[in-house]
Interface confidence: medium
Amino acid sequence: FKVATPYSLYVCPEGQNVTLTCRLLGPVDKGHDVTFYKTWYRSSRGEVQTCSERRPIRNLTFQDLHLHHGGHQAANTSHDLAQRHGLESASDHHGNFSITMRNLTLLDSGLYCCLVVEIRHHHSEHRVHGAMELQVQTGKDAPSNCVVYPSSSQDSENITAA
């Protein structure tokens, strides 16, 4: 399977909410011994590999923001901790998963990464991620609502396998 990032850039005004999205592509095994671990974190554009460094989002680590479920099951974070920080991650039946950030500030600008680990118990883990940039703007040049920029077809299938 692969992870696609439908949008590579989100430009939002301060105070707005934004939902960053990734999508699982390709065959998803629905076997009872296969589960998916999905999460989000901030990173930097490394010289070798994007998304290698895992930084917190609003002081919450990728461990705090995880979703864990079987194939094609819906899930969302019910963590009070995440919601207190204006964050919520969610996953639907169609392979889409997202993180919603409320009341954006300039400090939220940066590179965001989604991570999916397919866990085949007794056997292996397969890891893929996607990256997107969030720019929060203020002042007269800021858009009135979030503007999203589609990924090129090459960028939208941002694949890294363990």
């Epitope: 011994d33 589960t35 671990y37 999460t39 070798v48 290698s52 460094e53 895992r54 990728f62 461990q63 995880h66 864990h68 963590h79 991570l115 680990v117 866990i119 118990h121 007794h122 056997h123 292996s124 883990e125 890891r127 396998a161 363990a162």
Partner: antibody
Amino acid sequence: EVQLQQSGPELVKPGASMKISCKASGFSFTGYTMNWVKQSHVKNLEWIGLISPYNGGTSYNQKFKGKATLTVDKSSSTAYMELLSLTSEDSAVYYCARRAYGYAMDYWGQGTSVTVSS
Amino acid sequence: QIVLTQSPAIMSASPGEKVTMTCSASSSVSYMYWYQQKPGSSPRLLIYDTSNLASGVPLRFSGSGSGTSYSLTISRMEAEDAATYYCQQWSSYPFTFGSGTKLEIK
């Protein structure tokens, strides 16, 4: 604060079995795998296996199949490792450690010393 | 299973000296992880995903490598760095550790 508190040292007789506990606190127990590692007197670290509190799934190092049995009690956020038919070669320090998928073992218990002797 | 061979087995360094130790894998691995262990203590995560510092790890530590060859470097040795260092892989079951490099202070 993340903590993994293991049960105390054990002196057991050859042929006996025993169970080590690892009580987790300060994090979401079901969001991690609980891993067990053996460190013998020669100081080598060996991965025994893991259990997912999320669904009870286990994966074992083939070397420890039949020697170690991993279980969890979600209600008390406690992981257990039972060691069977102990011999002197099982004398070691055993650690539990949490691991997020796609990451590393970032928190470890303090270790449980097991001595097998008659 | 993937065998991780660490070298040297034992080394010593003076304070302020640069230290490099290596970990060679019998088959290619995607990422390497490094742990530090001091006598009487549990292992501590130092480096994840080959080159990233775990929380609270001093900036003098760094990791690099790919495929079958990885290394851990301490830019300037300090007395508190005296310990045994283990590499570890999560790429293939069973997950394995190297045999360790014991670093002593001169």
